[in-house]
Structure formats: structure tokens, C-alpha cells
């Protein structure tokens, strides 16, 4: 019949429904570089996976243009406040695009998690979750940054993570 | 034409697009058991529903293998801190699989919500949200746990909940 | 062949897969009205977009019946606590439906972000994230409310936002 081309596309699409781009990356010992760069992530071991998205130096890279729900959680914790800590911890998702020289803020949270500077002896924990829909072109990248990253707690990939899926 | 079998599959898939597995379960008076088990949930009344997922003793059960965005929010609150409260409240999503005897941590948050033990007279509120993409095989289950669950506040199903959908 | 009608539907659906309803609205200077109404949102500039959903006076309006993952984040912050502030900040997503005269609570968080009233000199930040799956009929609306909205911080649309997509 005359539907050949479209038919093949539909068959392909049916198969690739299970290939809707998605990823979940997990925190690892190497996530915190101290270099001022974005957090780095585990892409294969344990709960981590990439399906239809690429990874490069901390960034999820879109292979297919469209709208993506992107998310990240970071586990914060400490005993009192480290010296020199600003009153704000900033956790954000940022886009890198060839069309613009600087990273673009997408989703950002600010928190004051560690209480007063005088309570130096107190163990505290806090968590920051971000999620939202953004548009990505092919080759555009999303990264996670935390300032001050000294407060990010990593253990087994369940407490700090980064992911996305096409909507 | 020769596309019969595939055609039926495509028609079926078009119909079942609206049956993409999804669920949203809500907190109820019976959610907190005090038994050390996971939280239990309302599956039918009010905002709660199951579509292509099953429920069993607090667990969402996958009927179809694939990647799911799973999420949970718990409302925490109290007047001061309860006796015996650790400095950490842990809120987590855990997987149960026939392939492994113990629950597997998927997504976890730790928080120190209720301030210092000395502030016994102070009403406080906090909320913990978790969400992320995980792979589930048919029959695998996801549950929510909160330690210490004495701090979870239930009222009308809007403040503490648990859900998932296939991505 | 005899599949004509259905074929057109399938072709249409393949094309409209990219038109799965989705939206992401961002906070703007005009978001906080002080009128007791819901928060208002930017729908076009910057990261904001509407795809298969409408917007009206702060509300996302469903054009297609189904289950939607709806979400909102608000950035809270201040220096101490404003006079008259209740000990609780409530951040919620609410449904408006022609079938019921009052707004229906969907997803709600309560937080005590600004510490004790005596700590008036301290800058603090906190963030509240909500997300969950709800059913919307055509014409039903979802809005975001924050009580007390005086504590919502707006800057560039990345810290306070509101979105949805069909699942």
C-alpha cells in the first residue's frame, strides 16, 4: 500500500516508545571535584542508567530535541556550619548551549540548612529537590551545581542524584 | 494487507496510550502502623487511583516492566522533638524484588526537621519530597518508609502521598 | 485499504506525540498580588511555555482530559520573621472545577522556614517543592497558593515556578 514510509516510521515509533529518552545518574565519591565545576555522576553502576541521552563531564546531553522533565536531589549535612559558609546554599540545574557562551539557570533553590553559626556541635541534615520541564535541543547539556559543595553528602547513590526524561 | 498483526498492535497501543501505568496514593489514618513496616496508603478514595499498577500492603507493584518515575512526599510536624528521636529523619523509597532477600534503597532523604531538643514548646513543620526514575520488572514492588514515622502528619491525603508513572 | 480512518488517527497521533500536553510557568514580579488570590505566572518569556494547556489568571487549564503530573516550587526567604506571620507557611496546588464551588486541595506542604520569631536579624532561605499525579477534565484548572505569600522570593523565574505534563 501507499503508506509504506509512514508505516515504517510508526513501527519504529512503537518500538522506540520504550526508548523514550530517560536517565537517572547517581552520586559517587568522585562527584565532588572541588574545582568549581559541576557535580559529576555515576552513569552505569547500581541504579544509574542512560537511555537515549548521553553523558559528558557531569552533563546530561540531549540526543533528541524536545521537552524534558529534569530533576536533581542533593543531600546536605554537617556538624555545625563550616567556616566561611555563606548563609545560603544554592542548588541548581543549568543549561549549556552552543548558542550562548555562559550557562543558563534553569531551576534553582536556595536554602539555609545548617542553622546558626553558634550551633557548631549539632549534627544536621537537609535535602534539596528540584524538578521541572525545560526544552533541550540536540547537543544541549544540563548540569547540576551546588554552592557550597562541601555540604553535599554522598554515600550510595540514593541521596544525591540527577535525572531526566522526555515528556 | 500484510500488516495485520502489527496493525492490531498499533491500534491497541494507541488505545492504551491512555493506559500508561500511573498511580497516586494518599495518606490516611491507617497509614502509620507503628509496626516497623512501610507506610500504608489509600488507593481508591478521593485523589487516589491505580492505573496499570497494583497495590499490596503499602507497595506499588509493577504489572509492566520498564522505567518509572516514582515519587513520595511526607509532611512532618510536631511540637518540639519527641523523646528518642535521632537527629535524622529518614524518608525513603525502597524496592522489593524476588531476586534479592532485602529491600533495596532507591531514593532517600535525611532531614533534621524539629530543631534542638531544648525547643520543646515550638510547633514546627517540614516536608520531604523524593522523586526519580527507576527500573521495575513485573512483580517488583516499591514501598515508602519513614523513620521516625511518629513525625508524619496525616490529614486529608494532600500532605503525604506516594505515586508513580511509566516514562 | 480499509484502515483509512484509523490510519489518519494514527498518523495524527504520531505527530501529536510531540504535542503531549506540557507547560512550565515561571515566577515574575507580577506573581504576588497581595489580593488573597493565587500566584500569577509568566507564560511566554524565558523558560516559560504552554503546549496543549491554557492559562488563565494564574491557572493552568486542561484542554484534554487525563492524568497530569503537576508540580510547583516556591523559593522562600527573609530576614527574621515578619510580624503577624503564622508558624506555618502553606504551599499548595488546588483544583478549580465547574462541578464544585470551592477549590479542592490537591497537593499541599506546610513548613516553618524562618525559625523562631526572636531571630529577627538572621537571613534565611528555604524552598518548597510539590509534585504529583492528578486527574483533570477538560476545562478544569490548577492554581498555586502560598500563605503567607510575603515570604515568596522572585527573581528570574528559576526559583519559583509551576508546571504540568500529561502522563
Amino acid at each position: 500500500d501507499g503508506h509504506g514510509g509512514s508505516w515504517e516510521q510508526l513501527i519504529q515509533e512503537r518500538r522506540s516508545h520504550q526508548n523514550n529518552p530517560a536517565a537517572h545518574l547517581t552520586g559517587a565519591n568522585s562527584s565532588l571535584t572541588g574545582s568549581g565545576g559541576p557535580l559529576l555522576w555515576e552513569t552505569q553502576l547500581g541504579l544509574a542508567f542512560l537511555r537515549g541521552l548521553d553523558y559528558h563531564d557531569g552533563a546530561l546531553v540531549a540526543n533528541k530535541a524536545g521537552y524534558y522533565y529534569i530533576y536533581s536531589k542533593v543531600q546536605l549535612g554537617g556538624v555545625g556550619c563550616p567556616l566561611g559558609l555563606a548563609s545560603t546554599i544554592t542548588h541548581g540545574l543549568y543549561k549549556r548551549t552552543p548558542r550562548y557562551p555562559e550557562e543558563l539557570e534553569l531551576l534553582v533553590s536556595q536554602q539555609s540548612p545548617c542553622g546558626r553559626a553558634t550551633s557548631n556541635s549539632r549534627v544536621w541534615w537537609d535535602s534539596s529537590f528540584l524538578g521541572g520541564v525545560v526544552h533541550l535541543e540536540v547537543g544541549e547539556e544540563v548540569v547540576v551545581r551546588v554552592l557550597d559543595e562541601r555540604l553535599v553528602r554522598l554515600r550510595d547513590g540514593t541521596r544525591s542524584y540527577f535525572g531526566a526524561f522526555m515528556v | 494487507d500484510g500488516h495485520g498483526g502489527s496493525w492490531e498492535q498499533l491500534i491497541q497501543e494507541r488505545r492504551s496510550h491512555q493506559n500508561n501505568p500511573a498511580a497516586h496514593l494518599t495518606g490516611a489514618n491507617s497509614s502509620l502502623t507503628g509496626s516497623g513496616g512501610p507506610l500504608l496508603w489509600e488507593t481508591q478514595l478521593g485523589l487516589a487511583f491505580l492505573r496499570g499498577l497494583d497495590y499490596h500492603d503499602g507497595a506499588l507493584v509493577a504489572n509492566k516492566a520498564g522505567y518509572y518515575y516514582i515519587y513520595s512526599k511526607v509532611q512532618l510536624g510536631g511540637v518540639g522533638c519527641p523523646l528518642g528521636l535521632a537527629s535524622t529523619i529518614t524518608h525513603g523509597l525502597y524496592k522489593r524484588t524476588p531476586r534479592y532477600p532485602e529491600e533495596l534503597e532507591l531514593l532517600v532523604s535525611q532531614q533534621s526537621p524539629c530543631g534542638r531538643a531544648t525547643s520543646n514548646s515550638r510547633v514546627w513543620w517540614d516536608s520531604s519530597f523524593l522523586g526519580g526514575v527507576v527500573h521495575l520488572e513485573v512483580g517488583e514492588e516499591v514501598v515508602v518508609r519513614v523513620l521516625d514515622e511518629r513525625l508524619v502528619r496525616l490529614r486529608d491525603g494532600t500532605r503525604s502521598y506516594f505515586g508513580a508513572f511509566m516514562v | 485499504d480499509g484502515h483509512g480512518g484509523s490510519w489518519e488517527q494514527l498518523i495524527q497521533e504520531r505527530r501529536s506525540h510531540q504535542n503531549n500536553p506540557a507547560a512550565h510557568l515561571t515566577g515574575a514580579n507580577s506573581s504576588l498580588t497581595g489580593s488573597g488570590g493565587p500566584l500569577l505566572w509568566e507564560t511566554q518569556l524565558g523558560l516559560a511555555f504552554l503546549r496543549g494547556l491554557d492559562y488563565h489568571d494564574g491557572a493552568l487549564v486542561a484542554n484534554k482530559a487525563g492524568y497530569y503530573y503537576i508540580y510547583s516550587k516556591v523559593q522562600l526567604g527573609g530576614v527574621g520573621c515578619p510580624l503577624g506571620l503564622a508558624s506555618t507557611i502553606t504551599h499548595g496546588l488546588y483544583k478549580r472545577t465547574p462541578r464544585y464551588p470551592e477549590e479542592l486541595e490537591l497537593l499541599v506542604s506546610q513548613q516553618s522556614p524562618c525559625g523562631r520569631a526572636t531571630s529577627n536579624s538572621r537571613v534565611w532561605w528555604d524552598s518548597s517543592f510539590l509534585g504529583g499525579v492528578v486527574h483533570l477534565e477538560v476545562g478544569e484548572e490548577v492554581v498555586v497558593r502560598v500563605l503567607d505569600e510575603r515570604l515568596v522570593r522572585l527573581r528570574d523565574g528559576t526559583r519559583s515556578y509551576f508546571g504540568a505534563f500529561m502522563v
Epitope: - | 510536624g77 510536631g78 535521632a86 511518629r150 | -
Partner: antibody, heavy 121, light 111 residues
Framework: QVQLVQSGAEVKKPGASVKVSCKAS????????VHWVRQAPGQGLEWIGA????????SYNQKFKGRATLTADKSTSTVYMELSSLRSEDTAVYYC??????????????WGQGTLVTVSS | EIVLTQSPATLSVSPGERATLSCKAS??????????MNWYQQKPGQPPRLLIY???NLESGIPARFSGSGSGTEFTLTISSLQSEDFAVYYC?????????FGQGTKLEIK
């Protein structure tokens, strides 16, 4: 069934200390707070404090802080209340009581039979 | 601390009649839709016995003639039809914050 059995009556001199025990049975000892309440002859009820046997955490009425010490022994499911620097106005019946699991509703659903402590020179 | 004031100090009622006991708190004891007020009965030589918890919930094993009501700062214990075994001292207790405090008691006596 839930039972709280207290030690016997005590007579003490002013300035001395007394240690009253409360043995619990019929429930998971480490899951519930145990509170101590006293009642002077012909008077009302006064809360002294509570202990969480799960980890030994304690909370005291400021009035008794420094004089009362609450402890729990998981191996014997027994809670102890020690009151030091006794004075005549400490003469009272001392009760242990189990607190509800859900801490915000700290009602006392089971009580010991009471221990009379008499402080007299 | 939260002060609880019970009234009357003594209440004389005939068997079969209704008894209403009052308890007022110096500040609200409400939290998240619940009122953290409890009621106990005490007979001579016995420990107190829990009747009502969180203002209106009847403890298991307690006869249905006992009921509790109120919110905020004002609470009531009602005994709908007094039986001979109900004559005792009744205490209210707040569990909103520590120190947990009791009212001074209401003595319910036979008229």
C-alpha cells in the same frame, strides 16, 4: 496484657536518694515512652519526666531537673526513677505510666500500681 | 508551662443524671486539627485510669457514657448517666508540650 509493676514502698531521710523501679511487660518495651508522675497525699498529679527505652533519651520537668534521673534497662524491660536530695515535700506516691506511641499525643494509657516514698527525719 | 484550671472543684450529682466537668487551658493545645487534652479517672488508693485522649477519643474498654469535647483552650468531659462506680476524682492533662501538666482535679460525689 500490658503491665507495669513497681517496687515497694520506701522510707528515706531528708538529703538521701531513692530509686524506684518499674518493670514492663506485655508490649514492645523499646517502642513506648515511660513517664513518671507523682501525687502528694491529698494532692493532684505532677509530671516528673519521661524516658524513651529505645535509646535512653530523657525529658524532664524543669522543676526536677538535676534531682531526678530516669534510666531504662532493655535487658530486663525495667525503667528506674532516682530522686536525690530528698526533702519532706517529696513525700508522695510515685507512678510510672506508659506513654502513647504517637508522641504528640502523650497520654498515659497504662499505669503502675504506685510506690509510696516517705521522707521523714 | 501550660496551666489547666478545672471547675468545679467538687460536683454533686445524683446517679442516673448527667455530669459536665470543665477544663480550661492557659493557652491553646491544638495542633494539626487535634486537641492534645486527655481525661483520667482516679479512685482512692488506685492509679489514674485513662478515659479520653486527644479531647474526644474514647479509650478502649471505657463505657460509652463518657465523652469528651472542646478545642483550643476549653474542654469538657461529660458523663451522660452517672453510675455508682463513676464517683471519683477526674483530672484533665495536656500533652501539647512539656512539662505535661494536670488540672487540680474535680471531685464527683453522690448527691
Amino acid at each position: 496484657q500490658v503491665q507495669l509493676v513497681q517496687s515497694g514502698a520506701e522510707v528515706k531521710k531528708p538529703g538521701a536518694s531513692v530509686k524506684v523501679s518499674c518493670k514492663a511487660s506485655g508490649y514492645t518495651f523499646t517502642s513506648y515512652n515511660v513517664h513518671w508522675v507523682r501525687q502528694a497525699p491529698g494532692q493532684g498529679l505532677e509530671w516528673i519526666g519521661a524516658v524513651y527505652p529505645g535509646n535512653g533519651d530523657t525529658s524532664y520537668n524543669q522543676k526536677f531537673k538535676g534531682r531526678a534521673t530516669l534510666t531504662a534497662d532493655k535487658s530486663t524491660s525495667t525503667v528506674y526513677m532516682e530522686l536525690s536530695s530528698l526533702r519532706s515535700e517529696d513525700t508522695a506516691v510515685y507512678y510510672c505510666a506508659r506513654g502513647s506511641y504517637y508522641y504528640t499525643s502523650s497520654y498515659f494509657d497504662h499505669w503502675g500500681q504506685g510506690t509510696l516514698v516517705t521522707v521523714s527525719s | 508551662e501550660i496551666v489547666l484550671t478545672q471547675s468545679p472543684a467538687t460536683l454533686s450529682v445524683s446517679p442516673g443524671e448527667r455530669a459536665t466537668l470543665s477544663c480550661k487551658a492557659s493557652q491553646s493545645v491544638d495542633f494539626d486539627g487535634d486537641s492534645y487534652m486527655n481525661w483520667y479517672q482516679q479512685k482512692p488508693g488506685q492509679p489514674p485510669r485513662l478515659l479520653i485522649y486527644t479531647a474526644s477519643n474514647l479509650e478502649s474498654g471505657i463505657p460509652a457514657r463518657f465523652s469528651g469535647s472542646g478545642s483550643g483552650t476549653e474542654f469538657t468531659l461529660t458523663i451522660s448517666s452517672l453510675q455508682s462506680e463513676d464517683f471519683a476524682v477526674y483530672y484533665c492533662q495536656q500533652s501539647y508540650e512539656d512539662p505535661f501538666t494536670f488540672g487540680q482535679g474535680t471531685k464527683l460525689e453522690i448527691k
